[in-house]
């Protein structure tokens, strides 16, 4: 039996059916739901035979419905049970408020019965525009939502509806004005160079996601140069610009896809860095010196090219540090024209090339160092040298034995001769000559020279001294003297000086006929073209005359006697005895004796006769004073 059909409302859009039935195994139940006024076709539902209740959703609110049910059991349909019931009134949304308003978003709050809606449909529409509304749905359990992506300072109408089973509540609306976008502060250009600039800006911290910088050449339709930088930055270097060019730089902040009003600044980049005043000067014959001016920008380097004007193929390239403003280029050819070019490199940019031409000087040469006019204390130097190059010549005079101090002369580069004086005679010298031109010194050339000996007169020697004279000898330079004058004066100046003139080739004079045993001064002078040297002097004493003395007679016999005497040792060559009777009645007897003898027995005389005896010595052919004695032979 199918009975007790009850219908109750389940909210405003559904009904609940309950029934009882015997516990036979109904195959199923057939339920028909029809608007009471039969406006719409009935809805049929088949539910399992085990059920005793069912919810019928999706109905119209506040609508009377006729609900019928029958069961089917073994193909048999039970009688139909029917009942009438109305759905409830649709629930209304409470109120909607804007809880928070920003410049690009707002927060929407609303009230609504719990569980009444599947979702809420929110529409955001700019007031007074025909732009499409922004629609969004939020789950029916929410009572609040953020609406992002709005425009700043813009009127919006916001509408919300509750939606369930295709039913929407009456919309609730609210009007709101978004706030102004937070302003960015100042945009300034703090550094400007020829190819870059630095931007600085101020803005509240944490406001912006990123900044967009746009760099546009003023008065140009060329595409702007855009760059995006993180919102944490407040400064940015803008590289890659053109020199001497006006630029408009704009900056805007972006927050959640929204851009601020742009800030703009105009700036002109500096002119290209230029090198200026390239000056090339010769550094002697094998080099050039370059000087240039350049702004004190941080040049990475300079590139210099040096090329012989007439030889295009052989260029010399130098890369120099950017701090330099001058350089010497050595190792060039003498007397050669060169083209010199220079450019600077700064941040990869090459400045325009500056060029200049200059010639190296003719290679200075010195040679043919010649020594002439040598005297005992001087000589002349002459040499050849390239004209117009040398500032000075340096002459060094070094004696070969390195006993004397080196003498250095610096003389004008116009000179080709020099007189070197004040040198010692008879000395070997090495002469070194070098030329000095600006920043160069030539190789040194040399010559040797020996100063003449002064016409020396020296070594006055007295030899062979005897009682009656001596020999004078001296030394003198060859061919130095025309004549010599030998002057002999007795020490007491009692006698007239004796002068002897000898030829310039003589070196010796034997003097004879002087007085024995007295002092003499000897002077020897040389004469050259009538000019007298200061004399050499010597003093000498002639020997005393050698003496024979103490002639004694002894041992008289009838025919003779013995004679003895004394004499200076080693002086006499021999002795001569002369014996004659005092009455001169017989021939005199003369006996020559050898030097060592000091006694002699005389025989062969007459008895008792008186004899006169004379004795003298002979020395170098000269006779000494004679000594005498008287002797008488004995009686027979």
């Amino acid at each position: 039996e199918l009975e007790n059909l009850t219908v109750t409302e389940v909210g405003w859009d559904g009904l609940r059916l309950n029934w009882t039935a015997a516990d036979q195994a109904y195959e199923h139940f057939i339920i028909q739901v029809q608007e009471a006024n039969k406006v719409e076709a009935a809805r049929n539902l088949t539910v399992p035979g085990s059920l005793r209740a069912v919810d019928i959703p999706g109905l119209k609110a506040a609508t009377p419905y006729t609900v019928s049910i029958y069961g089917v059991i073994q193909g048999y349909r039970t009688p139909v049970l029917s009942a009438e019931a109305s759905t409830g009134e649709t629930p209304n949304l409470g109120e909607v408020v804007v809880a928070e308003v920003g410049w690009d978003a707002l927060k929407l709050n609303w009230t609504a019965p719990e569980g009444a809606y599947e979702y809420f449909f929110i529409q955001v529409q700019e007031a007074d525009t025909v732009e499409a509304a922004q629609n969004l749905t939020v789950p029916g359990g929410l009572r609040s939502t953020d609406l992002p992506g709005l425009k700043a300072a813009t009127h919006y109408t916001i509408t919300i509806r509750g939606v369930t089973q295709d039913f929407s509540t009456t919309p609730l609306s609210v009007e709101v004005l978004t706030e102004e976008v937070p302003d960015m502060g100042n945009l300034t250009v703090t550094e400007v160079s020829w190819d870059a600039l630095r931007l600085n800006w101020t803005t509240p911290d944490g406001t912006y996601d990123q900044f967009t910088i746009q760099v546009q050449e003023a008065d140009q339709v060329e595409e702007a140069h855009n760059l995006t930088v993180p919102g944490s930055l407040r400064s940015m270097e803008i590289p890659g610009l053109r020199a001497g060019t006006p630029y408009t730089v704009t900056l805007h902040g972006e927050v959640r896809g929204h851009s601020t009003r742009p800030l703009a600044v105009e700036v002109v980049t500096e002119d290209l860095p230029q090198l200026g005043d390239l000056a090339v000067s010769e550094v002697g014959w094998d080099g050039l010196r370059l000087n240039w001016t350049a702004a004190d920008n941080a040049y990475e380097h300079f590139v210099i090219q040096v090329q012989e004007v007439n030889k295009v193929e052989a260029a010399q390239n130098l890369t120099l540090p950017g701090s330099l403003r001058a350089v010497d280029i050595p190792g060039l050819e003498a007397a050669t024209p060169y083209r010199v070019s220079i450019y600077g490199v700064i941040r990869g940019y090459r400045t325009p090339v500056l060029s200049a031409e200059a010639s190296t000087a003719k290679e200075p040469e010195i040679g043919n160092l010649n020594v002439s006019d040598i005297t005992p204390e001087s000589f002349n130097l002459s040499w050849m040298a390239t004209d117009g190059i040398f500032e000075t010549f340096t002459i060094e005079i070094i004696d070969s034995n390195r006993l004397l101090e080196t003498v250095e002369y610096n003389i004008s580069g116009a000179e080709r001769t020099a007189h070197i004086s004040g040198l010692p005679p008879s000395t070997d010298f090495i002469v070194y000559l070098s030329g000095l031109a600006p920043s160069i010194r030539t190789k040194t050339i040399s010559a040797t020279a020996t100063t003449e000996a002064l016409p020396l007169l020296e070594n006055l020697t007295i030899s062979d001294i005897n009682p009656y004279g001596f020999t004078v000898s001296w030394m003198a330079s060859e061919n130095a003297f025309d004549s010599f004058l030998v002057t002999v004066v007795d020490s007491g100046k009692l006698l007239d000086p004796q002068e002897f003139t000898l030829s310039g080739t003589q070196r010796k004079l034997e003097l004879r006929g002087l007085i024995t045993g007295i002092g003499y001064e000897v002077m020897v002078s040389g004469f050259t073209q009538g000019h007298q040297t200061k004399p050499l002097r010597a003093e000498i004493v002639t020997e005393a005359e050698p003496e024979v003395d103490n002639l004694l007679v002894s041992d008289a016999t009838p025919d003779g006697f013995r004679l003895s005497w004394t004499a200076d040792e080693g002086v006499f060559d021999n002795f001569v005895l002369k014996i004659r009777d005092t009455k001169k009645q017989s021939e005199p007897l003369e006996i020559t004796l050898l030097a060592p003898e000091r006694t002699r027995d005389i025989t062969g005389l007459r008895e008792a006769t008186e004899y006169e005896i004379e004795l003298y010595g002979i020395s170098k052919g000269r006779r000494s004073q004679t000594v005498s004695a008287i002797a008488t032979t004995a009686m027979g």
Partner: antibody, heavy 118, light 108 residues
Framework: EVQLVESGGGLVQPGGSLRLSCAAS????????MGWVRQAPGKGLEWVSA????????YYADSVKGRFTISRDNSKNTLYLQMNSLRAEDTAVYYC???????????WGQGTLVTVSR | SSELTQDPAVSVALGQTVRITCQGD??????ASWYQQKPGQAPVLVIY???NRPSGIPDRFSGSSSGNTASLTITGAQAEDEADYYC???????????FGGGTKLTVL
């Protein structure tokens, strides 16, 4: 009285030649050494050349060596100076002088002017 | 350049003594000779050797020598002594006669 009289001076072009003479009297010419000394205008004395008594030995300053020749003729009591390849710097008064063996130049002539110029 | 060096000019008051010097290496060996030359005239020998005067030269002129320096002394200078004075010596066989550069003596 000793007398020395020079002659032969004059104007000559560079590279030219002149011969100076010196006539001697009042002393034994053949027993005296003789010489030439010159004096450029406004300058000092410069010895030029000398010759011994018989003429066998001659002496020259470096500045004239190879260009000047001194000689004498004892029979004529005359001293000579032959000057070749003359230069502007040879312009001077040239004095003839004598000296005995043991005395420098003790008598001088009055000089003769030699001018070397274009 | 001369091997004998003289002062270019020296002056003396009338009647005073003046010394004119000459320096050179050769004077270590040789005596100097001295010549007086007045304008437009030939030189005149006044001193030679150690201290010899030719006849006619007043005895106020004297010579001396020490080391490499020779001196001519005029004791009681007279107006007529105003002249150029040249020292002279030998420098040996290569330079048998050399002259100094000369000293102009002015008698005030």
């Amino acid at each position: 009285e000793v007398q020395l009289v020079e002659s032969g001076g004059g104007l000559v072009q560079p590279g030219g030649s002149l011969r100076l003479s010196c006539a001697a009297s009042g002393f034994t010419f053949s027993g005296s050494r003789m010489g030439w000394v010159r004096q450029a205008p406004g300058k000092g004395l410069e010895w030029v050349s000398a010759i011994n008594e018989e003429g066998g030995q001659t002496y020259y300053a470096d500045s004239v060596k190879g260009r000047f020749t001194i000689s004498r003729d004892n029979s004529k009591n005359t001293l000579y100076l032959q000057m070749n390849s003359l230069r502007a710097e040879d312009t001077a008064v040239y004095y003839c002088a004598k000296h005995p063996p043991h005395r420098p130049f003790d008598y001088w002539g009055q000089g003769t002017l030699v001018t070397v110029s274009r | 350049s001369s091997e004998l060096t003289q002062d270019p000019a020296v002056s003396v008051a009338l009647g005073q003594t003046v010394r004119i010097t000459c320096q050179g290496d050769s004077l270590r060996s040789y005596y100097a000779s001295w010549y007086q030359q007045k304008p437009g005239q030939a030189p005149v020998l006044v001193i030679y050797g150690k201290n010899n005067r030719p006849s006619g030269i007043p005895d106020r002129f004297s010579g001396s020598s020490s080391g490499n320096t020779a001196s001519l002394t005029i004791t009681g200078a007279q107006a007529e002594d105003e002249a150029d004075y040249y020292c002279n010596s030998s420098h040996g066989p290569r330079r048998p006669v050399v002259f100094g550069g000369g000293t102009k003596l002015t008698v005030l």
